[in-house]
């Protein structure tokens, strides 16, 4: 439209904007690496960072790994989205006994109400079944099915946990605290020495968390312990450790009780875009080690861009024909530059590029 021409010209003159003919508006040009959240962004707030697959943009604006629901007892409730983590919950028929951020550290099977009790509230993914005494006159055969349930004004009793030794019990499930029942395969891990006091069903102020060792009376030397593959974060929450399962990552530091697993790019690659405790994008290390000595400056200067070829490939380490050099007789390893010059590198840490800050940041 002719009347749009002045707007279009003004817009074109501004490198930070562009003209969108479809909406006939001047739009803000999102900086490199940021993507518009709407068709014609008007301001920087309309642009967002885009994370790698299986990462999301957290509230602090960092790309953070989505939790994994790969455990057998978990199902995906919400997928990994650009601005929110995947959310996992216990599979049907189970409830979460130990919650962690966006997932569950320990799922237990829903209780089956014992004889003489009926279901007051059926179990959900978050809560166990709640049982109540069957009203007088209700046949014991009607104790469990929900359609036999009658209103009751009584209080909701918690089933008394009965210590059962899995070695001798032939029940398919065993009671645990609050009437919780574990499948026998899980229960079989709870065997105890004959004659020892049972800890099954013992009340706990923090279910699913245990001290590092028995706490002496008055001792403060106890800490919460999270499930495997979770760590206790600074806020005191059990948080999933990042996964290093991507082909281009290797584990640098294992998942510990108070710190996440740390992943780094596998040998021969370098991190082009980092992520909390991991790397969102690994690329092949683009500089090949010199065989011996240094090449003349005019022969050695060569600019390349970081690209990510298929995992498993290495950058071409033979000098390019334009350089007029013959290919090296042997293919040097990508660490040979550092290794062969170790005498010159003095005390540079090998685990991280270099640690300079003495402030502990």
């Amino acid at each position: 439209f002719p009347q749009d021409r002045p707007f279009e010209d003004t817009c074109r003159g501004n490198p930070g904007h562009y003209y969108d003919k479809a909406v006939r508006r001047c739009c803000y040009r999102c900086p490199t690496g940021l993507f518009p959240t709407q068709q014609c962004p008007q301001r920087p707030a309309d642009c967002r960072k885009q994370c790698e697959p299986d990462y999301y943009l957290d509230e602090a604006g960092r790309c953070t790994a989505c939790v994994s629901c790969s455990r057998d007892d978990l199902v995906e409730k919400m997928p990994c989205a650009w601005n929110s983590s995947r959310v996992c919950e216990c599979q049907p028929g189970m409830f979460c006994a130990v919650s962690v951020v966006n997932s569950c550290a320990r799922c237990f099977f829903h209780s089956v109400c014992p004889a003489g009790m009926i279901v007051k509230f059926p179990g959900t993914a978050q809560k166990n079944t709640v049982c109540e005494p069957a009203s007088p006159g209700v046949s014991p055969a009607c104790a469990s099915p929900e359609n036999c349930k009658e209103p009751s004004s009584g209080t909701i009793p918690q089933a008394k946990p009965t210590p059962v030794s899995p070695a001798t019990s032939n029940a398919s499930t065993m009671p645990l605290r609050g009437g919780t029942r574990l499948a026998q395969e899980a229960a079989s891990k709870l065997t105890r020495a004959p004659g020892s006091p049972s800890s099954v069903g013992r009340p706990s102020s923090d279910p699913g968390l245990s001290p590092t060792q028995p706490c002496p009376q008055g001792s403060g030397d106890c800490r919460k312990q999270c499930e495997p593959d979770y760590y206790l974060d600074e806020a005191g929450r059990c948080t999933a450790c990042v996964s290093c399962s991507r082909d281009d990552l290797v584990e640098k530091t294992p998942c510990a009780w108070n710190s996440s697993r740390i992943c780094e790019c596998r040998p021969g690659m370098i991190c082009a875009t980092s992520a909390t405790n991991s790397c969102a994008r690994c690329v092949p290390y683009p500089i090949c080690a010199a065989e011996t000595g240094t090449k003349p400056q005019d022969m050695a200067e060569k600019d390349t861009t970081f690209e990510a070829p298929p995992v498993g490939t290495q950058p071409d380490c033979s000098p390019t024909p334009e350089n007029g050099e013959a290919p090296a007789s042997t293919s040097p390893t990508l660490s040979s530059l550092v290794d062969s010059q170790a005498s010159k590198t003095l005390p540079i840490p090998t685990s991280a590029p270099i640690a300079l800050s003495s402030t502990g940041k």
Epitope: K302, V338, T345, A352
Partner: nanobody, 121 residues
Framework: QVQLVESGGGSVQAGETLRLSCTAS????????MAWYRQAPGNECELVSI???????YYTDSVKGRFTASQDNAKNTVSLYLKSLQPEDTAVYYC???????????????WGPGTQVTVSS
Amino acid sequence: QVQLVESGGGSVQAGETLRLSCTASGFTFDGPDMAWYRQAPGNECELVSIISADGRTYYTDSVKGRFTASQDNAKNTVSLYLKSLQPEDTAVYYCAADPRRNCRGNCCGNWGPGTQVTVSS
């Protein structure tokens, strides 16, 4: 004791140039490769450039043709020449020794104070 100190940052208009310097003490630049990283507020650390011990240079796509890395072994200094700066180049720039040793996630905690570059349109 190994130390790296970056300098040369500042506030400029889009299209202008800056030269960042990184001075090392405690080791010599004829050993490990050196890298330049940057981190914009709220963003992860991004690898910008690597300069090898023998002077070969490498750049990430977004800066290729605009940024130039160089080194002066005699002065134990590496430099990054930033031309045709754009607002999206706004970040804290860091230099790091031996980038072959991968970073621990948020790499910016591993180096010195860095130098702030602010580009306004």
